[in-house]
């Protein structure tokens, strides 16, 4: 049975270039090890934005230099992407893999379109 992954269709980044969204998956089994990957799709090219593996019940930890942070609660992951600029506007796909125990399951969301608007520079003041 396929694993369903749900994520919002659209998110608007804050003026500070921060975007948050929830990625929720319907687990077909009792996974203890889950890997979550955020992918960016642009012009049919897919690249990895960030990824984290976590044990169920433990916190989600991205690498120190990652632009992502997140928290997990059951089958729900709250993802935050930082440092976004207008050129980063695009489709961000949440990918979930149930790594352990067997069987392995793959779940791919439909993607969240993140819109990023660069803030207007402050006018010079005399």
């Amino acid at each position: 049975k396929a694993m369903h992954v749900a994520q919002p269709a659209v998110v608007l980044a804050s003026s500070r270039g921060i975007a948050s969204f929830v990625c929720e998956y319907a687990s077909p089994g009792k996974a203890t090890e889950v890997r979550v990957t955020v992918l960016r799709q642009a012009d049919s090219q897919v690249t990895e934005v960030c990824a984290a593996t976590y044990m169920m019940g433990n916190e989600l930890t991205f690498l120190d230099d990652s632009i992502c942070t997140g928290t997990s609660s059951g089958n729900q992951v709250n993802l935050t992407i930082q440092g976004l600029r207008a050129m980063d506007t695009g489709l961000y796909i949440c990918k979930v893999e149930l790594m352990y125990p067997p069987p392995y399951y793959l779940g791919i969301g439909n993607g969240t379109q993140i819109y990023v608007i660069d803030p207007e520079p402050c006018p010079d003041s005399d």
Epitope: R35, P102, P103, Y104
Partner: antibody
């Protein structure tokens, strides 16, 4: 460009062992899950085994479980398949394949032929 | 284990004709997790379609995929001489990863 090059195939007697290698280049090997897939002469494709990007998770087809071991050395950009207790039915071309970001096997090596015969 | 059954086993067609290949799964496969591969004699398989209908990089638009649930189709709108090969469907949504037995598209 992405390249996968298998080596280590050959003729081996039943019950003996063989180790296959797959040298990867043109991409960040340590970020990708990898597979071995085989194809018996004149037959279809059969998935053999999977290893996660970091080597911590491995899965095997029932037909090879307990006899084959998949491993990887990310510092050498190389994938391995240790095949023990080989049988005639293991005779096949063995391909290594990369898992693309969205799941399909997006790049394949050219394959290496393993013949198990007395 | 998800069993994939392809039909027909062999398809005999002429260049320029339309080819329709079928892949049926023993249980539901999400459309995000169905791929098609092409294999020519002496060569490794090549990814054509993933996610049931997305073309892989460099694949011409005469190749298209469709379907959902348990029934999937690969269509080649106008066969070119280089399209005569064996085609495999595959599911990659859960282990064990499985392939169909293949459909050979041969010149009539």
């Amino acid at each position: 460009q992405v390249q996968l090059v298998e080596s280590g195939g050959g003729v081996v007697q039943p019950g003996r062992s063989l180790r296959l290698s797959c040298a990867a280049s043109g991409f960040t090997f340590s970020s990708y899950h990898m597979h071995w897939v085989r194809q018996a002469p004149g037959k279809g494709l059969e998935w053999v085994t999977f290893i996660s990007y970091d080597g911590n998770n491995k899965y095997y087809a029932d037909s090879v479980k307990g006899r084959f071991t998949i491993s990887r050395d990310n510092s050498k950009n190389t994938l391995y398949l240790q095949m023990n207790s080989l049988r005639a039915e293991d005779t096949a071309i063995y391909y290594c394949a990369r898992t693309g970001w969205l799941g399909p096997f997006d790049y394949w090596g050219q394959g290496t032929l393993v013949t198990v015969s007395s | 284990e998800i069993v994939l059954t392809q039909s027909p086993g062999t398809l005999s067609l002429s260049p320029g004709e339309r080819a329709t290949l079928s892949c049926r799964a023993s249980q539901s496969v999400g459309s995000s997790y169905l791929a098609w591969y092409q294999q020519k004699p002496g060569q490794a398989p090549r990814l054509l379609i993933y996610g049931a209908f997305s073309r892989a990089t460099g694949i011409p638009d005469r190749f298209s995929g469709s379907g959902s649930g348990t029934d999937f189709t690969l269509t080649i709108s106008r066969l070119e001489p280089e399209d005569f090969a064996v085609y495999y469907c595959q599911q990659y949504g859960s282990s064990p990863w499985t392939f169909g037995q293949g459909t050979k598209v041969e010149i009539k």
